[in-house]
């Protein structure tokens, strides 16, 4: 067995509606049947969990209903979307992939995607 590497884009710009999407790709060293994907946010030296989902290979990944994340999976690639972002949420978002089953367990951590969020300017009052 060898190390698992995780790739993700260096920079992503959120849309004006506060939505950011990026791909998290991992090189699976084994035949995993159960995979857990976690999005972490690193600000200074503090790391917090944004969202997480476990899925069985071949099935869709499902986040909790109240999660700000959605995603789809295709092979060793996960397409992640984070919603409801505001300027204060600008930061480094790290993709963490765990191959949970069968053993051995593998952990892979991406270098992080810097997500820039710009709050939209409020519409000026119109005289018309």
């Amino acid at each position: 067995c060898k190390a698992m590497h995780v790739a993700q884009p260096a920079v992503v710009l959120a849309s004006s509606r506060g939505i950011a999407s990026f791909v998290c790709e991992y090189a699976s060293p084994g035949k995993a049947t159960e995979v857990r994907v976690t999005v972490l946010r690193q600000a200074d030296s503090q790391v917090t969990e944004v969202c997480a989902a476990t899925y069985m290979m071949g099935n869709e990944l499902t986040f909790l209903d109240d999660s700000i994340c959605t995603g789809t999976s295709s092979g060793n690639q996960v397409n992640l979307t984070i919603q409801g972002l505001r300027a204060m949420d600008t930061g480094l978002y790290i993709c963490k992939v765990e191959l949970m089953y069968p053993p051995p367990y593998y952990l892979g951590i991406g270098n992080g995607t810097q997500i820039y969020v710009i709050d939209p300017e409020p519409c000026p009052d119109s005289d018309f």
């Epitope: 698992m4 972490l40 790391v47 969990e49 949970m100 952990l107």
Partner: antibody, heavy 118, light 108 residues
Framework: QVQLVESGGGVVQPGRSLRLSCAAS????????MHWVRQAPGKGLEWVAV????????HYADSVKGRATISRDNSKNTLYLQMNSLRAEDTAVYYC???????????WGQGTLVTVSS | EIVLTQSPGTLSLSPGERATLSCRAS???????LAWYQQKPGQAPRLLIY???SRATGIPDRFSGSGSGTDFTLTISRLEPEDFAVYYC?????????FGPGTKVDIK
């Protein structure tokens, strides 16, 4: 601040069992994976076992597989290690440690000494 | 399991000198999953470096980590009296997680 306090160590005869406990405070226990690491007298560190934050996943070192059970009670902020069929080579200081979100261990207890001897 | 080998076993140096400690893995380890710990006699270990090169909170910048694949290095740029201790590397990328046997840094 983060505190991990181990208990349950002592002298035990070969073949007997022992349960170690670790009382955690100063952080949200239910959000962290927890590990046991041991150190035989005058020797290096040996990773023993890990349990996920919710207890859903557990892994063990080959040296204790089949003899050790790691468990946790999130309502009591307590981690456990049940060791059965103890051997002389299980003699060590057992450390309770906290896992961080990025996978590494960042806090250690002061350890509890287990001596397996007849 | 991944076997970690540390060298040298003992490093005898004087305060102010540079210490270079090596950790070699029996197979490739993700650089995101390699940590270094310091242990002084009678004390629990303390996290120094995680992710091969990230300093833990409160660790002085004289400690630095580098490496990838199977070869990793911990460097102490200028040894202070409190740095004389045993240093362990650990991989946490593949279960079972494993520690190296340690390198003792003592005063020459």
């Amino acid at each position: 601040q983060v505190q991990l306090v181990e208990s349950g160590g002592g002298v035990v005869q070969p073949g007997r069992s022992l349960r170690l406990s670790c009382a955690a405070s100063g952080f949200t226990f239910s959000s962290h994976g927890m590990h046991w690491v041991r150190q035989a007298p005058g020797k290096g560190l040996e990773w023993v076992a890990v349990t996920w934050y919710d207890g859903s996943n557990k892994h063990y070192a080959d040296s204790v597989k089949g003899r050790a059970t790691i468990s946790r009670d999130n309502s009591k902020n307590t981690l456990y290690l049940q060791m059965n069929s103890l051997r002389a080579e299980d003699t060590a200081v057992y450390y309770c440690t906290r896992g961080e979100l990025l996978g590494y261990v960042d806090y250690w207890g002061q350890g509890t000494l287990v001596t397996v001897s007849s | 399991e991944i076997v970690l080998t540390q060298s040298p076993g003992t490093l005898s140096l004087s305060p102010g000198e540079r210490a270079t400690l090596s950790c070699r893995a029996s197979q490739s380890v993700s650089s995101s999953c390699l940590a270094w710990y310091q242990q002084k006699p009678g004390q629990a270990p303390r996290l120094l470096i995680y992710g091969a090169s990230s300093r833990a909170t409160g660790i002085p910048d004289r400690f630095s980590g580098s490496g990838s694949g199977t070869d990793f290095t911990l460097t102490i740029s200028r040894l202070e009296p409190e740095d004389f201790a045993v240093y362990y590397c650990q991989q946490y990328g593949i279960s079972p997680f494993t520690f190296g046997p340690g390198t003792k840094v003592d005063i020459k």
